[in-house]
């Protein structure tokens, strides 16, 4: 007998063909011999089956000797053997209906697990293979689980159900709720304005929740809540904000914070958490602030950085257009009795300049020790 696979909620068309290319009498029955539908002349007649309101045929095809059974809004329990009686012949078609659903919401937080459950008719032994948007294949039987969802798992999952050498394909859209970046570093000279941005990696029509930014300053012994806020239909409203620093937060997405100036006491790292309505768990993004200061006191020219720098970063002091006078993998460097001219303090990673601060050293005959800063913006 012919096997047809169907998807829960979909429409299936079971074919039945007579040798005569004209409209003749036909009946469709289920395995219990209960009539589903048939014809009486050019009229469609229906029997007392459970499919009554969901069964149909195509009258336009009857004249060609085709008498299909169309079943709409398929249910797992529609799986059965359907018999078409035409011209004293019986054509049997076995319909197997499968359903594949995410057993939780399809909007999941990064790091959570996704479980896909296959609904199948009794007696069937299907196999399932799913391909994630990043090309990862997973196989299973009645259930498939993916732990520790990542941002790249967002998108359409394509799952193939195989039964009796036939296959049916399901597409499930999964949204992984996360920030675009897990971590970011902002490099600033002392006194410069600081902007932190926390773009989300997903878009939803209505976004509601609450969030907080905790800050651990390098100089402080404990972390401090800098700001708490609510999110209602994508509108940000600040609930509580620290007085030092004087933070401002934008009222629309992406989440955005500004500090009027970078100061050594603010250098450190923060953790922004966002709890979304009707979701367990929180979204996290780490943000780091590195602050540079170049100063001249008496005969000592010093450059310092504060904040979370990697040990491989190089801090250098050099006179403009000359070789570096001092270059160390440390957070402070200095030059004694510096020559007059424009000095540059550079924080670099493998030759790439991350942060630069310029300071002018005046000739000592001018009274010595006087100085001023020049800020070059990148």
């Amino acid at each position: 007998k012919k096997v047809v696979l169907g998807k829960k909620g979909d429409t299936v068309e079971l074919t039945c063909t007579a040798s005569q290319k004209k409209s003749i009498q036909f009946h469709w029955k289920n395995s219990n011999q209960i009539k589903i539908l048939g014809n009486q002349g050019s009229f469609l007649t229906k029997g007392p089956s459970k499919l009554n309101d969901r069964a149909d045929s195509r009258r336009s095809l009857w004249d060609q000797g085709n008498f299909p059974l169309i079943i709409k809004n398929l249910k797992i329990e529609d799986s059965d053997t359907y018999i078409c009686e035409v011209e004293d012949q019986k054509e049997e078609v076995q319909l197997l209906v499968f359903g594949l659903t995410a057993n939780s919401d399809t909007h999941l937080l990064q790091g959570q697990s996704l479980t896909l459950t296959l609904e199948s008719p009794p007696g069937s032994s299907p196999s399932v293979q799913c391909r994630s948007p990043r090309g990862k294949n997973i196989q299973g039987g009645k259930t498939l689980s993916v732990s520790q969802l990542e941002l790249q798992d967002s998108g359409t999952w394509t799952c193939t159900v195989l039964q009796n050498q036939k296959k049916v394909e399901f597409k499930i859209d999964i949204v992984v709720l996360a920030f675009q970046k897990a971590s970011s570093i902002v490099y600033k000279k002392e006194g410069e304005q600081v902007e932190f941005s926390f773009p989300l990696a997903f878009t939803v029509e209505k976004l509601t929740g609450s969030g907080e930014l905790w800050w651990q300053a390098e100089r402080a012994s404990s972390s401090k809540s800098w700001i708490t806020f609510d999110l209602k239909n994508k509108e940000v409203s600040v609930k509580r904000v620290t007085q030092d620093p004087k933070l401002q937060m934008g009222k629309k997405l992406p989440l955005h914070l500004t500090l009027p100036q970078a100061l050594p006491q603010y250098a450190g790292s923060g953790n922004l958490t966002l709890a979304l309505e009707a979701k367990t768990g929180k979204l996290h993004q780490e943000v780091n602030l590195v602050v540079m200061r170049a100063t001249q006191l008496q005969k000592n020219l010093t450059c310092e950085v504060w904040g979370p720098t990697s040990p491989k970063l190089m801090l250098s002091l050099k006179l403009e257009n000359k070789e570096a006078k001092v270059s160390k993998r440390e957070k402070a460097v200095w030059v004694l009795n510096p020559e007059a001219g424009m000095w540059q303090c550079l924080l670099s990673d493998s030759g790439q300049v991350l942060l630069e601060s310029n300071i002018k050293v005046l000739p000592t005959w001018g009274g010595g020790g006087s100085h001023h800063h020049h800020h070059h913006h990148h």
Partner: antibody
Framework: EVELLESGGGLVQPGGSLRLSCAAS????????MSWVRQAPGKGLEWVSG????????YYADSVKGRFTITSDNSKNTLYLQMNSLRAEDTAVYYC????????????WGKGTTVTVSS | AIQMTQSPSSLSASVGDRVTITCRAS??????LGWYQQKPGKAPKVLIY???SLQSGVPSRFSGSRSGTDFTLTISSLQPEDFATYYC?????????FGQGTKLEIK
């Protein structure tokens, strides 16, 4: 076409109260944030108060905080500004303005209503 | 509150001139700034939103730009109907704040 029409202005003594209304037509009121902006005679524009589309969040300029209250009635498509403890420096033309989708900018303004606080 | 410093406060120019007005924000405000034109006895009208987007129906001689916390409104070739007062408005966060205004007069 979206239209905003302010009313309720007039002459009031210092310490008195007034309620301004802003009737909106041609829009789904609850979708948009709204603001009140004022302009004292011969002076620049000053933002006074704002309300989110849902009506849940309200905001005020420091100069009016504790004295003015912004509310909206979505069923009447009307924005209100209740002004108490009025001072001479509150004398101004008061405009109501609708914000664009996603709170981008004030894209529609009313013609304004004049409030004079004087004894 | 975020301060908006607008300059110049007044400006004399002739038809056909290129004119620029600037606003500086005391904090970073992304692109969350609009430019508004107001004529005597009338309500303000938006020209530019989100720092550089031209409002529908506004002539293309108006343009806006941003550099950090500095915002500029440029009128490429002044027309007689452009003589008015111009304001910037930050809508980054509440309380919103306007610049002091720039009165553009005929020379």
């Amino acid at each position: 076409e979206v239209e905003l029409l302010e009313s309720g202005g007039g002459l009031v003594q210092p310490g008195g109260s007034l309620r301004l209304s802003c009737a909106a037509s041609g829009l789904t009121f609850s979708t948009f944030a709204m603001s009140w902006v004022r302009q004292a005679p011969g002076k620049g524009l000053e933002w006074v108060s704002g309300i989110s589309g849902s009506g849940e969040n309200t905001y005020y300029a420091d100069s009016v905080k504790g004295r003015f209250t912004i509310t909206s009635d979505n069923s009447k498509n009307t924005l209100y500004l209740q002004m108490n403890s009025l001072r001479a420096e509150d004398t101004a033309v008061y405009y109501c303005a609708k914000e664009g989708y996603n709170w981008n900018y004030m894209d529609v303004w009313g013609k304004g209503t004049t409030v004079t606080v004087s004894s | 509150a975020i301060q908006m410093t607008q300059s110049p406060s007044s400006l004399s120019a002739s038809v056909g001139d290129r004119v620029t007005i600037t606003c500086r924000a005391s904090h970073g405000i992304r692109n969350d700034l609009g430019w508004y034109q107001q004529k005597p006895g009338k309500a303000p009208k938006v020209l530019i939103y989100e720092a550089s987007s031209l409002q529908s129906g506004v002539p293309s001689r108006f343009s806006g730009s941003r550099s950090g916390t500095d915002f500029t409104l440029t009128i490429s070739s002044l027309q007689p109907e452009d003589f008015a007062t111009y304001y910037c408005l930050q809508d980054y966060t509440y309380p919103y704040t306007f610049g002091q205004g720039t009165k553009l007069e005929i020379k």
